[in-house]
């Protein structure tokens, strides 16, 4: 398998992590959370290639029968290998609570 | 979030299980694996509509933003959520071996 | 390094008042979330209040709601509890906590001791 | 509130012993629960946090697992300078809570 940084498409363009700034608005939680007012988001995105950053064996048979018939099977895609965990301060029916979110914000990312 | 096989593109377009029957030759397979000779391969093949089969609260917020951001935010992607074993009989330096491979054939999908 | 130094140790009768301090150096307080925890005599850890790292965000435990306020004083590095109508289940060592941004204690002070006795 | 019951409430242990104690919360919290330890006359000390992660400077024979409800945290080769009491707290959500601890001494 590929280096996850040695992209054969050009720097930055293969499966990786990125930051989207959003508003409360944008994510379509400004009734429900109080703060923070904007997430950066982490995000995976980018093509995967054949075995860059394959995840598992699923992923190398993907990559092969998508080599085979594309129009069938798709490319293996850019996902959260694991997550950072986010506190969000919401809205309750009892006033404001602190949660805790497992699974909002990608840490890095594989090909799956 | 709408109900597995509810697809608003129509029955069967959206994330959901599908098997592809491949060859040894056709996974690359051929000289290293013995048996099956060929494998019914299950994977997730489909689309990702809003909130279809949402993993997580990640899956939430990536389809927020691609409605947003279509050009730099991906829609989610139909990915496996667990997997099946599966039993290889293999060549090895010193004969044959059988081996169980956990990450091989997608069990159930979800989207994210 | 990070220090956290609590202050405002004493004996105060039930219904009293009480201020307890927490100077904060070694690190950029104003980017950081504070809490107080408590440790009552019989060695339970009690999670008592909650600051976010501007102030505008404040959650306290049932037990002290309306009896305690948290502050703080990010120009002067320093966080605040003030305790009134004081009882004696509030007897307890009070710690000064720093939050690390997912609600666990990575930095504790050495802790201040209020006793409420008649 | 979640509450976080830990057992057991002591641990006589030997140097050397491999110990084990758990903490169940009373609902599902992923695994946002954390592990202190405290010494006699010292303020508290965070070992573990997120379930299994090791804070800096933590040795690698304290370990902590679990996810959901049931957690395990374990010293795998007990030291004369573990003796102290352990807490388990969530991290899921205010109230923020700790369990009782577990007392760890000499046999």
């Known amino acids: 398998a590929r280096n996850g940084d040695d992209c054969p498409l050009g720097p930055g363009r293969c499966c990786r992590l990125h930051t989207v700034r959003a508003s409360l608005e944008d994510l379509g939680w400004a009734d429900w959370v109080l703060s923070p007012r904007e997430v950066q988001v982490t995000m995976c995105i980018g093509a995967c290639p054949s075995q860059f950053r394959a995840a598992n064996m699923h992923a190398q048979i993907k990559t092969s029968l998508h080599r085979l018939k594309p129009d069938t099977v798709p490319a293996p895609c850019c996902v959260p290998a694991s997550y950072n965990p986010m506190v969000l301060i919401q809205k309750t029916d009892t006033g404001v609570s602190l949660q805790t979110y497992d699974d909002l914000l990608a840490k890095d990312c594989h090909c799956i | 979030a709408r109900n597995g096989d509810d697809c608003p593109l129509g029955p069967g377009r959206c994330c959901r299980l599908h098997t592809v029957r491949a060859s040894l030759e056709d996974l690359g397979w051929a000289d290293w694996v013995l048996s099956p000779r060929e494998v019914q391969v299950t994977m997730c093949i489909g689309a990702c509509p809003s909130q279809f089969r949402a993993a997580n609260m990640h899956a939430q917020i990536k389809t927020s933003l691609h409605r947003l951001k279509p050009d730099t935010v991906p829609a989610p992607c139909c990915v496996p959520a667990s997997y099946n074993p599966m039993v290889l009989i293999q060549k090895t330096d010193t004969g044959v071996s059988l081996q169980t491979y956990d990450d091989l054939l997608a069990k159930d999908c979800h989207c994210i | 390094d990070v220090k956290l130094v609590e202050s405002g140790e004493g004996l105060v009768k039930p219904g009293g008042s009480l201020k307890l301090s927490c100077a904060a150096s070694?690190?950029?307080?104003?980017?950081?979330?504070m809490s107080w925890v408590r440790q009552t005599p019989e060695k339970r850890l009690e999670w008592v209040a909650y600051?976010?790292?501007?102030?505008?965000?404040?959650f306290y435990a049932d037990t002290v709601k309306g009896r305690f306020t948290i502050s703080r004083d990010n120009a002067r590095n320093t966080l605040y509890l003030q305790m009134s109508s004081l009882k004696s289940e509030d007897t307890a060592m009070y710690y000064c906590?720093?939050?690390?941004?997912?609600?666990?204690?990575?930095?504790w002070g050495q802790g201040t001791l209020v006793t409420v006795s008649a | 509130s979640i509450v976080m019951t830990q057992t057991p409430k002591f641990l006589p242990v030997s140097a050397g012993d491999r110990v084990t104690m758990t903490c169940k919360a009373s609902?599902?919290?992923?695994?946002?629960v954390a592990w202190y330890q405290q010494k006699p006359g010292q303020s508290p000390k965070l070992l573990i946090y997120?379930?299994?992660n090791r804070y800096t400077g933590v040795p690698d024979r304290f370990t902590g697992s679990g996810s959901g409800t049931d957690f395990t945290f374990t010293i795998s080769s007990v030291q004369v300078e573990d003796l102290a009491v352990y807490f388990c707290?969530?991290?899921?959500?205010?109230?923020?809570?700790f369990g009782a601890g577990t007392k760890l001494e000499l046999k």
């Open positions: 906590t720093r939050d690390d941004g997912y609600l666990w204690f990575a930095y």
């Open positions: 070694g690190f950029t307080f104003s980017s950081f979330a």
């Open positions: 600051i976010t790292s501007g102030g505008d965000y404040i």
């Open positions: 609902q599902n919290v992923g695994n946002n």
């Open positions: 997120y379930a299994s």
């Open positions: 707290q969530q991290h899921y959500s205010s109230p923020l809570t």
